[in-house]
Interface confidence: low
């Protein structure tokens, strides 16, 4: 039975040219996290494997930085980065948990950031 829940940064906004941290946190389960995939719509951005570390998709390598933790930092944001992002936690023995984040990249210099989720 899957008892875990994923907390995410939710809906967030950022300024064009800036950077943003995408973060998810898996709680309420003792399952072992074996791998976390970060995806934008159907496109793989990055993989963090518990044993092998990070693999950044080549087309995002210069704008995506691993971390903090299992999160992902997007840099040099463009309006085209607006959209849904998914953190997919592969766990044993529970299986797969998915979290959703919606990022809006604004042209305006008055981008209002929603409440930021911080992992202590």
């Amino acid at each position: 039975m899957m008892t875990g829940t994923i907390e995410t940064t939710g809906n967030i906004s950022a300024e064009k040219g800036g950077s943003i941290i995408l973060q998810c946190h898996l709680s309420s389960t003792t399952a072992q996290v074996t791998q976390v995939n970060w995806e934008q719509q159907d496109q793989l951005l990055a993989i963090c494997n518990a044993d092998l570390g990070w693999h950044i998709s080549p087309s995002f390598k210069d704008r995506v930085a691993p971390g903090p933790g299992l999160g992902l930092t997007l840099q040099s944001l463009t309006v085209n980065d607006t959209g849904e992002y998914f953190c997919i936690y592969h766990t044993y023995p529970d299986g797969t948990y998915t979290g959703r984040i919606f990022l809006e990249v604004l042209e305006s210099s008055v981008a209002e950031h929603g409440a930021r989720f911080q992992i202590p």
Epitope: C48, A50, D51, L52, G53, W54, H55, I56, S57, P58, K61, A65, P66, G67, P68, G69, L70
Partner: antibody
């Protein structure tokens, strides 16, 4: 721009020691796995050692050929990677490269082990 | 340890031709395979990661394919600047072993 610059190579006698350094810039050092790879003259690449990132506790892995003789370490405050090489043998003669996750490599430093 | 076997040490190809370099792993590596190009006196240059993903700035005449244990690097319309030694590397399981290299020459 990501930069990796190795130093510390040179001529050393068999049984001797050497410490290689890899100065890095252009990225957040603590977020990346770092490795050492070597290449004897005219031969193939050989993966030597890995040190993981902060998120993975800076744990290390070694190839059988250097385990117990070489030690990989990192100075996260200065963004420098090290390879401490002890009990060197003639077959350790090679160009030593440091590499960052994502395909970035330095230009290498030459180590020659000879009497 | 996973052994990586590049069956051809040398390949001779005509300019403008097509070449396929093969790499076989001793165990499944789940597409965690990289291809590097190395020219004399230079550090290796990453061409492909994840078995098929072309690195930024690498010409589209390079492509990677394969799965499980068997992988290939293909170069179409061979150019003089493609003369180099090509290495595969698995990064599924430490130690992250390399193949022995395939040296490409112009016929």
């Amino acid at each position: 721009e990501v930069k990796l610059v190795e130093s510390g190579g040179g001529l050393v006698q068999p049984g001797g020691s050497l410490r290689l350094s890899c100065a890095t810039s252009g990225f957040t050092f603590i977020d990346y796995y770092m490795s050492w790879v070597r290449q004897p003259p005219g031969k193939a690449l050989e993966w030597l050692a890995l040190i993981r990132n902060k998120a993975n506790g800076y744990t290390t892995e070694y190839s059988v050929s250097v385990k117990g003789r070489f030690t990989i370490s990192r100075d996260n405050s200065q963004s420098i990677l090290y390879l401490q090489m002890n009990t060197l043998r003639a077959e350790d003669s090679a160009t030593y490269y440091c590499a960052r996750d994502g395909g970035y490599w330095g230009q290498g430093t030459l180590v020659t082990v000879s009497a | 340890d996973i052994q990586m076997t590049q069956s051809s040490s040398y390949l001779s190809v005509s300019l403008g031709g097509r070449v396929t370099i093969t790499c076989k792993a001793s165990d499944h590596i789940n597409n965690w395979l990289a291809w590097y190009q190395q020219k004399p006196g230079n550090a290796p240059r990453l061409l492909i990661s994840g078995a098929t993903s072309l690195e930024t700035g690498i010409p589209s005449r390079f492509s990677g394919s394969g799965s499980g244990k068997d992988y290939t690097l293909s170069i179409t319309s061979l150019q003089t600047e493609d003369v180099a030694t090509y290495y595969c590397q698995q990064y599924w399981s430490t130690p992250f072993t390399f193949g022995s290299g395939t040296k490409l020459e112009i016929k």
